[in-house]
Interface confidence: medium
């Protein structure tokens, strides 16, 4: 790596990928192995994110880009650049402090995460249920009941009260 | 970091259709549900509906059904809306957001795209 | 599903405190804890302030805060300060299939 010969700041023409070196008279010298800086004029290098146990590495770290980690089968990403594993749960449950629990009456899921979401009310729109719902479907809506033929009913669930998992007001 | 990016302004003719796009990268597409919102000049903000990214299951505001169509390509981490017999009252700014939940709490819309103006003129 | 309700404007000095209200309905805002308030300024996308009714997302100022009584939601935004100015909406999750609906909008003057 050549000496920067900046009249200014000598570490600002160190490239990504290395550091100013300030033990060898501010020369540019590459990042150590797990390490990396992503711009230029750097006068350390991070360190990379190492992704272990519940993490598997999604990207290796380079000398210029950190390593960037997703989770292993059977759990999912939260947060920024996937800070969390989370567990994932079956289509029809949402994950609480309990571990995964059904979706209550009323609500469905057709996630292996997030949270349990109450049925469309169909009667809000004014149209009836044309398919029901289930833990891992919402309902159909269908036409309003008055567009039905004689005779014809429906049912339609009550909304649940709040949605599981969060506190009661 | 999460990034929505949508793409980029359109002029329609009355009766036209507009298909807006939204490609979404920082975080897992299909794990959370991609809303769209519109905005009229001057005005507030509207819900259109949602999309599962995984499922490729969709609601729409009810206002809006018959005309939009949501859809997805998860490989390519991108959410569409499309908006057909376009009349002068849907010139708006359309955005695509993100539903998210953690841990802590559900969000509703978080992070939003920039925004795409949707100008319909004959 | 019609649009929550909203004043339309609402101002202060700054370092005073101003409250924002939000009515809606039980099939939305009474019934869930799923309140959303959102700060747009112009030309650009809103961005989230309060979620769960009271809770703020990292990066926002605790100077703004969100409770709920019954079918009405509110925004407090205490100390006042010049960026603050801008439009303020209120969302809900509803039981309808028009799943998420917002406030008619509130514009925030500093004075």
């Known amino acids: 790596f050549e000496r920067t010969r900046s009249l200014q700041d000598p570490c600002s023409n160190c490239p990504a990928g290395t550091f100013c070196d300030n033990n060898r008279n501010q020369i540019c010298s590459p990042c150590p192995p797990n390490s990396f800086s992503s711009a230029g004029g750097q006068r350390t290098c991070d360190i990379c994110r190492q992704c272990k146990g519940v993490f598997r590495t999604r990207k290796e770290c380079s000398s210029t880009s950190n390593a960037e980690c997703d989770c292993t089968p059977g759990f999912h990403c939260l947060g920024a650049g996937c800070s969390m594993c989370e567990q994932d749960c079956k289509q029809g449950q949402e994950l609480t402090k309990k571990g995964c629990k059904d979706c209550c009456f009323g609500t469905f899921n057709d996630q292996k995460r997030g949270i349990c979401r109450p049925w469309t009310n169909c009667s809000l729109d004014g149209k009836s249920v044309l398919v029901n719902g289930t833990k891992e479907r919402d309902v159909v809506c269908g036409p309003s009941p008055a567009d039905l033929s004689p005779g014809a009913s429906s049912v339609t669930p009550p909304a649940p009260a709040r949605e599981p998992g969060h506190s009661p007001q | 970091q999460v990034q929505l990016v949508q793409s980029g302004t359109e002029v329609k003719k009355p009766g036209a259709s507009v298909k807006v796009s939204c490609k979404a990268s920082?975080?897992?597409?299909?794990?959370?549900?991609i809303h769209w919102v519109r905005q009229a000049p001057g005005q507030g903000l509207e819900w259109m509906g949602w999309?599962?990214?995984?499922?490729?299951?969709?609601n729409y505001a009810q206002k809006f059904q018959g005309r939009v169509t949501m859809t997805r390509d998860t490989s390519i981490s991108t959410a569409y809306m499309e908006l057909s017999r376009l009349r002068s009252d849907d010139t708006a700014v359309y955005y695509c957001a993100r539903d998210y939940y953690d841990s802590s709490g559900y969000f509703g819309p978080d992070y939003w795209g920039q925004g795409t103006l949707v100008t319909v003129s004959s | 599903q019609s649009a929550l309700t909203q004043p339309p404007s609402a101002s202060g000095s700054p370092g005073q405190s101003v409250t924002i209200s939000c009515t809606g309905t039980s099939s939305d805002v009474g019934a869930y804890n799923f309140v959303s308030w959102y700060q747009q300024h112009p030309g650009k996308a809103p961005k989230l302030m309060i979620y769960d009714v009271s809770n703020r997302p990292s990066g926002v100022s605790n100077r703004f805060s969100g409770s709920k009584s019954g079918n009405t939601a509110s925004l407090t935004i205490s100390g006042l300060q010049a960026e603050d100015e801008a439009d303020y909406y209120c969302?809900?999750?509803?039981?309808?299939?028009?799943?998420?609906?917002f406030g008619t909008g509130t514009k925030v003057t500093v004075l």
């Open positions: 920082g975080y897992t597409f299909t794990g959370y549900y």
């Open positions: 999309i599962n990214p995984n499922s490729g299951g969709t």
């Open positions: 969302s809900s999750y509803t039981s309808s299939s028009t799943r998420w609906v």
